[in-house]
């Protein structure tokens, strides 16, 4: 099966790699602009230079292109706890991330919020905190895992989901005569 190509992809595929078809004359292939630049004017004829101009401050192009405008630099979302890892340059967008000991939670494909990694107090680290995943904790005896925090079984009330997790401790409190039974 031949994949469906958009008009722009169809036009570009007529020319060799690194070139694009002139929008007004499909017999002319113009050289694409380098990253960090954008298309100011198409090449006037075969073998003639494309007029490419450098992106202005606050904009970029990250790959060779024939865009009429550079792309606007992304801004890190402070309200999401994001910090700037590296600034925008003419050929690379801003890189945003989280602070040390934080992980990312993505609300959408491109939007993430930073959350503090769990410290596993009253437990041990089973898996360390990663860029997109919180620490995985294993709780000490007498504690249960609640939203990745180890909480004392004394806070576990009947009918809550912690009862199974705290059951061994509850049984131990009853006395030694029950400890040998299954």
């Amino acid at each position: 099966l031949v994949p469906h190509l958009g008009d722009r992809e169809k036009r570009d595929s007529v020319c060799p790699q690194g070139k694009y078809i002139h929008p007004q004359n499909n017999s002319i292939c113009c050289t694409k602009c380098h990253k960090g630049t954008y298309l100011y004017n198409d090449c006037p004829g075969p073998g003639q230079d494309t007029d490419c101009r450098e992106c202005e401050s606050g904009s970029f192009t990250a790959s060779e292109n024939h865009l009429r405008h550079c792309l606007s630099c992304s801004k890190c979302r402070k309200e999401m706890g994001q910090v700037e890892i590296s600034s925008c340059t003419v050929d690379r967008d801003t890189v945003c991330g989280c602070r040390k000991n934080q992980y990312r939670h993505y609300w959408s494909e491109n939007l993430f919020q930073c959350f503090n990694c769990s410290l596993c107090l009253n437990g041990t680290v089973h898996l360390s905190c990663q860029e997109k995943q919180n620490t995985v904790c294993t709780c000490h005896a007498g504690f249960f895992l609640r939203e990745n925090e180890c909480v004392s079984c004394s806070n576990c009330k009947k009918s809550l989901e912690c009862t199974k997790l705290c059951l061994p401790q509850i049984e131990n409190v009853k006395g030694t005569e029950d400890s040998g039974t299954t």
């Epitope: 939670h105 609300w107 959350f115 995943q133 939203e147």
Partner: nanobody, 120 residues
Framework: EVQLLESGGGLVQPGGSLRLSCAAS????????MGWVRQAPGKGLEWVSA????????YYADSVKGRFTISRDNSKSTLYLQMNSLRAEDAAVYYC?????????????RGQGTLVTVSS
């Protein structure tokens, strides 16, 4: 067994308001981030808003900021979404969901949904 039951959807004119509710049971409601996810006809799921267990932290999608307000009543195990200045593009099935933090976008455990129609 976890249960999330949404209500409050309906037909509203552009510029109108609706208040969605979600009654939760089968888990300790106040321990969890909760939120609202929507799915418009022919489109994917998207997080609209979310709120931390204590209610101290919230998230809003850019498209609803300033128009929608999320809140919760932990004593009633109920989540709310007040939707004002509704637009045609807000029409969707709205689901109440438990948020699973980390990675994503993931849509956690969801209810059956309530339909919001915005039309004149």
């Amino acid at each position: 067994e976890v249960q999330l039951l949404e209500s409050g959807g309906g037909l509203v004119q552009p510029g109108g308001s609706l208040r969605l509710s979600c009654a939760a049971s089968g888990f300790t409601f106040e321990w969890y981030w909760m939120g609202w996810v929507r799915q418009a006809p022919g489109k994917g799921l998207e997080w609209v808003s979310a709120i931390s267990g204590s209610g101290g932290s919230t998230y809003y999608a850019d498209s609803v900021k300033g128009r929608f307000t999320i809140s919760r009543d932990n004593s009633k195990s109920t989540l709310y979404l007040q939707m004002n200045s509704l637009r045609a593009e807000d029409a969707a099935v709205y689901y109440c969901a438990k948020v699973k933090l980390g990675g994503g976008p993931n849509f956690g455990y969801r209810g059956q949904g309530t339909l919001v129609t915005v039309s004149s």
